[in-house]
């Protein structure tokens, strides 16, 4: 049996969209089917349709096709949003350029190259001819539009309305001339859908004839629409998988735009003074990492050999030794001039103001009444009245319903970190909104920082796990692996949740990460019996500026003699000065023959004011930070320890009171370390654990 060609590649898809006909004279045909591919095949062949099919809608809920003799550009028609509908428009009818000789051109240009109006195909005046629409079915000889029914050399043409000029070609550009890209086309979002050798591109949402990993839903920011050429992976120029089973992929012929025609929509916003988003567009001249170590030049191979070279990343402005983010990391970084520290983040570069216009909140935003209705990650907020059951589940009072109107960002649960909303996305049930505290607002969200008011420990009993006091057990320590190598520490705070730092995730692909639990040696040597290796299923970023991440494991860890959880402190608690604490990590130890064993450094808590003095007044600590100094000069956290815990004991109970993050020095003598204060974020952690679904063991 001859395999029917898959024609869905000839259609432009608009998700969640349908067409409504305002003109009742317009025809429409419907039928129950299983897939959009079936609708496409019938539309292309016009089989059993009383009109020329230009578009169709696939109703996913009813499994039904609606075929149209019109498209979204036709008069008497309007577009409408609808969750269950996907609109597919035949590209030939909406394209305003030609491919090759333009045999498939079905656009509406009706004027010749020299400006003469075309003669209608069905007319014999002023020129008699044999190109009748009935003789050339499927060639769309409609109205007086330019066409090339025989695929002749000059491209689309028409008979002219001038009796002196029988026919003339029309001036319709080649799609390869119209389409252009900047740089290497990573941000190209044009409509080129065939390769430089003329092969039709495979749809990104299809896995035939070529299976691939570039799924549109997995990479929503890569512009994987229909079967258009794209450059998601840093190629020299856009490409696509092809419909030829023997040619997996090929480049597309897209020329570089002249400077004045740059119309790429997705170029990261270029900034020089601050970081927007992940700083991929940062083009400033900061050239040291967070602790002042100068950066290595990108075009240098000393002291660190690397292949992040300017010619490998032509569009990333790898000039001099400036901090940049060429690889989609969390923020700008560079190789360092210190032979012992390969890379470092430039986390001292401030974030550009993310707030929307003049929108801001005071205190913790519980009285915010603005009308922003989008989360910081761009998700649209869902209506409060649809989520009241969930809200009641994590607050113990009746929320003020008068404030919870529409889907606006609000703070009904007194969240310390500002207004938020539910999203309707099951993976991200809720998130904060991109609103800043009003300038000059100094209302503290926790009071009396340096005076022990609330005890950090939840209980005064000594906890024992399987007969071993927890003080000798470091089973909550996690080694976060990036592409099979230790990159950061973390703390197991619940069977499915690890608390770590946001700087630990250089790539967005979760398949790059694993969590190793129950190990003492960073390579897992000798830990085979006790080691648990778990995949990562989600990253939940902490409140703005927190540098925290809650990492959800793909399955819960099994708690045993070697793997245990560590307690969180009470929200807003303070631990007395001089309390003895410890930091743990497998990071760089300063030793050439580093043995890979888990290290511990003993520190003691220092009040924020005294800590600031030790930093020569250059650092002002806020309520979200905690300070601890080394008992021994030069011992403390370092790169590779990031994400790991500052563990303190109170009433014989061990808790994670701090998280190690880049930014405040790598065991610098007489300089205490500054950590993210977990007590300040404890409510956020509990709220995530309570509201995010986790896999059952």
């Amino acid at each position: 049996q001859r395999k029917r060609r898959n024609t869905i590649h000839e259609f432009k898809k608009s998700a969640k969209t349908t067409l409504i006909k305002i003109d009742p004279a317009l025809k429409i045909k419907t039928k129950k089917v299983n897939t959009a591919d079936q609708c496409a095949n019938r539309c292309t062949r016009n089989k059993g349709l009383p009109f020329t099919c230009k578009a169709f809608v696939f109703d996913k809920a009813r499994k039904q096709c609606l075929w149209f003799p019109f498209n979204s550009m036709s008069s008497g028609v309007k577009k409408e949003f609808g969750h269950e509908f996907d609109l597919y428009e035949n590209k030939d009818y909406i394209r305003n350029c030609i491919i090759g000789k333009g045999r498939s051109y079905k656009g509406t240009v009706s004027i010749t190259k020299s400006g003469i109006k075309c003669q209608p195909w069905s007319s014999m005046i002023p020129h008699e001819h044999s190109f009748l629409p009935s003789s050339y079915r499927g060639k769309d000889l409609q109205e007086n539009y330019c066409r090339n029914p025989r695929g002749e050399e000059g491209g689309p043409w028409c008979f002219t309305s001038n009796p002196e000029v029988r026919y003339e070609v029309c001036d319709i550009p080649q799609c390869s001339e119209v389409e252009c890209m900047t740089c290497n086309g990573e941000s190209y979002r044009g409509l080129m859908d065939h390769t430089e050798s003329g092969k039709i591109c495979q749809r990104w949402d299809h896995q035939t004839p070529h299976r691939h990993k570039f799924l549109p839903e997995r990479y929503p920011d890569k512009g994987f629409d229909d079967n258009y050429c794209r450059n998601p992976d840093g190629q020299p120029r856009p490409w696509c998988y092809t419909l030829d089973p023997h040619t997996r992929w090929e480049y597309c012929a897209i020329k570089t735009c002249a400077d004045n025609t740059m119309n790429d929509t997705d170029v990261p916003l270029e900034t020089t003074e601050c970081i927007q988003g992940q700083g991929e567009g940062y083009r400033g001249t900061v050239n040291t990492i967070w602790n002042g170590i100068p950066c290595q030049r990108w075009d240098s191979q000393y002291p660190h050999e690397h292949d992040m070279t300017p010619e490998n990343f032509k569009c990333k402005d790898l000039r001099e030794n400036y901090c940049r983010n060429p690889d989609g990391s969390e923020s700008p970084w560079c190789f360092t001039t210190d032979p012992n520290i390969r890379v470092g983040y430039c986390s001292q570069i401030p974030n550009c103001d993310m707030s929307h216009g003049q929108d801001c909140y005071r205190g913790n935003g519980k009285n915010y009444m603005g009308n922003l209705s989008q989360t910081r990650s761009g998700l649209t907020c869902s209506m409060w009245d649809k989520n009241m059951e969930d809200l009641h589940r994590h607050i113990f009072w009746e929320p003020d319903a008068s404030k919870l109107n529409e889907n606006y960002c609000r703070n009904p649960d007194d969240d310390a970190h500002g207004p938020w909303c539910y999203t309707g996305n099951p993976l991200i049930p809720w998130d904060y909104c991109p609103i800043s505290r009003c300038e000059g607002d100094t209302t503290p969200t926790i009071v009396n920082l340096d005076h022990p008011v609330i005890s950090c420990a939840k209980t005064k009993q000594l906890r024992v796990v399987n007969g071993i006091p927890t003080r000798t057990n470091i089973g909550w320590m996690v080694s976060l692996r990036y592409r099979n190598k230790h990159i950061c520490g973390g703390s197991l705070i619940k069977e499915s949740w690890v608390l770590t730092a946001r700087q630990c995730f250089p790539s967005r692909d979760l398949k790059d990460y694993e969590a190793w639990l129950g190990i003492h040696d960073v390579h897992g040597r000798g830990d085979e019996k006790c080691k648990q290796v778990l995949n990562v299923s989600q990253l939940v970023y902490g409140p703005e500026g927190s540098d925290l991440v809650l990492m959800k494991l793909a399955r819960p860890a099994v708690l045993d003699d070697f793997v245990s959880t560590i307690d969180l402190p009470n929200y807003g608690c303070t631990i007395p000065e001089k309390t003895s604490c410890s930091v743990y990590g497998w990071g760089y130890t300063g030793l050439i023959n580093y043995d890979g064993l888990l290290r511990v450094a003993h520190l003691y808590i220092m009040g924020n004011e005294k800590c600031s003095q030790h930093h020569r007044g250059k650092v002002t600590l806020n309520e979200s930070e905690i300070c601890a100094g080394a008992e021994k000069i030069g011992s403390g956290p370092c790169e590779g320890d990031y994400g790991g815990p500052l563990v303190c004991e109170q009433h014989k109970m061990r808790m994670v009171l701090g998280v190690i993050v880049p930014g405040r020095g790598c065991a610098i003598p007489n300089r205490p370390g500054i950590f993210v204060r977990v007590a300040y974020y404890a409510k956020w952690i509990h709220k995530i654990i309570l509201t995010y679904k986790v896999p059952q063991s």
Partner: nanobody, 126 residues
Framework: EVQLVESGGGLVQAGGSLRLSCAVS????????MGWFRRAPGKEREFVAA????????WYADSVKGRFTISSDNAENMVYLQMNSLKPEDTAVYYC???????????????????WGQGTQVTVSS
């Protein structure tokens, strides 16, 4: 997925030359860094040479510097290792490897490479 197939190995006398080829097909990432490694009998696999796909930077092991040259034909998706003045200690299985650019490891490190060929035997007799 990227597949790498080496060819061009064989038996050669000391002082002679060989040219190894590596055919690169399929792909998941680009621009690549391409490397050659070798494993002599009873020894660990060791770095020989590497270069960025565009050829802007190349790296060589001290033991082969001045004798071996890594090159590529981008149009044909081929990477070559031209080996001159061969010595008996160059006897090994030679592997072609591919990596996407990254900051974590030096291009000399075996663990940096995600894709490997099956290897081709080079024997240098004295």
């Amino acid at each position: 997925e990227v597949q790498l197939v080496e060819s061009g190995g064989g038996l050669v006398q000391a002082g002679g030359s060989l040219r190894l080829s590596c055919a690169v097909s399929g792909r998941t990432f680009s621009p690549y860094t391409m490397g050659w490694f070798r494993r002599a009998p009873g020894k660990e696999r060791e770095f020989v040479a590497a270069r960025t796909w565009s050829g802007g930077v190349a790296w060589y092991a001290d033991s082969v510097k001045g004798r071996f040259t890594i090159s590529s034909d981008n149009a044909e998706n081929m990477v070559y290792l031209q080996m001159n003045s061969l010595k008996p200690e160059d006897t090994a299985v030679y592997y072609c490897a591919a990596k996407s650019p990254g900051r974590t490891y030096s291009p000399r490190e075996e663990r940096a490479y995600a894709r490997w060929g099956q290897g081709t035997q080079v024997t240098v007799s004295s």
